[in-house]
Amino acid sequence: KELKVTQPEKSVSVAAGDSTVLNCTLTSLLPVGPIKWYRGVGQSRLLIYSFTGEHFPRVTNVSDATKRNNMDFSIRISNVTPEDAGTYYCVKFQKGPSEPDTEIQSGGGTEVYVLAKPS
């Protein structure tokens, strides 16, 4: 099946201190390689979460990514702060013959708006 990375929400709004879910699904797990979430684009993009076992504070996977047929790579960001605002991209990589892996497809991006916490 042809690989497609889908981020269904163009944008989400979340109050500071709350949690938000950023959705991402794939149509295929092939070619093998990791899935990572970034904020921003280009050289300055920031790695937010990687489905490769590392620990990321405040960010967790939503579904059980250890399922061998898992195609849901959505993440939950907890205790959101104004600094978390920006556009988040779910990116599929193909394993490389050497570092780094090759980016092969990205979702369309989900913009996160952080609202001031109601007083």
């Epitope: 092939l30 093998v32 990791p34 490769t52 250890t66 399922k67 061998r68 047929n69």
Partner: antibody, heavy 118, light 107 residues
């Protein structure tokens, strides 16, 4: 330190059943997929079954499907392999192994010996 | 099935390469497992083609390209004598497989 300790091996007769256990410590067991691998005397390694971190999804090699069942109890940090209709060909050292994110293995137990003999 | 040589030998200090073929680069990740005696616990020396666990000496390295993976031991030592198993995970079939093992003898 990651530690995996298998138990439950022993000598059984052909056709009988056995349940192996693997006690895990030193890591967040509920976050990792796990597998069982065996090694028959004088032979190589053979993967048998795997289970997702939450326990809802299981995977088997064709030769043990329907006879072996992998399961886990996350609150008890334990992995199990229920084996039935055992034959002499099931004689082996059985290892539990922790899976990496891409379903290879990073840590192994010391193994437990199962002998099927009449 | 994954195919690897039955045996290799080397003198201490030499570089050893063990190859493993039969996987599909598009769908397979490779690992290498060291077993020092039959029935003893295997030790993972390389996973994810080229990732070395933190407690494994830096003389062990791995690579993969095409349909083959390679384990490289640079400056082999007597204590590296063991059987080395190539392992693979196939993302197409969701199945793990192993090669038959390569016996490394350090002369």
């Amino acid at each position: 330190d990651v530690q995996l300790v298998e138990s439950g091996g022993g000598v059984v007769r052909p056709g009988e059943s056995l349940r192996l256990s693997c006690a895990a410590s030193g890591f967040t067991f509920s976050s990792y997929a796990m597998s069982w691998v065996r090694q028959a005397p004088g032979k190589g390694l053979e993967w048998l079954a795997g289970i997702s971190a939450g326990g809802s999804d299981t995977y088997y090699i064709d030769s043990v499907k329907g006879r072996f069942t992998i399961s886990r109890d996350n609150p008890k940090n334990s992995l199990y392999l229920q084996m039935s209709s055992l034959t002499a060909e099931d004689t082996a050292v059985y290892y539990c192994a922790r899976e990496t994110w891409n379903h290879l293995f990073d840590y192994w137990g010391l193994g437990t010996l199962v002998t099927v003999s009449s | 099935a994954l195919t690897q040589p039955a045996s290799v030998s080397a003198n201490p200090g030499e570089t050893v390469k063990i190859t493993c073929s039969g996987g599909d680069y598009y769908s397979t990740y490779y690992a290498w497992y060291q077993q020092k005696s039959p029935g003893s616990a295997p030790v993972t020396v390389i996973h994810s083609d080229d990732k070395r666990p933190s407690d494994i000496p830096s003389r062990f390295s791995g690579s993969a390209s095409g349909s083959a993976a390679t384990l490289i031991i640079t400056g082999v030592r007597v204590e590296d004598e063991a059987v080395y198993y190539c392992g693979g995970y196939d993302g197409r079939t969701y199945i793990n497989t192993f090669g038959a093992g390569t016996t490394l003898t350090v002369l």
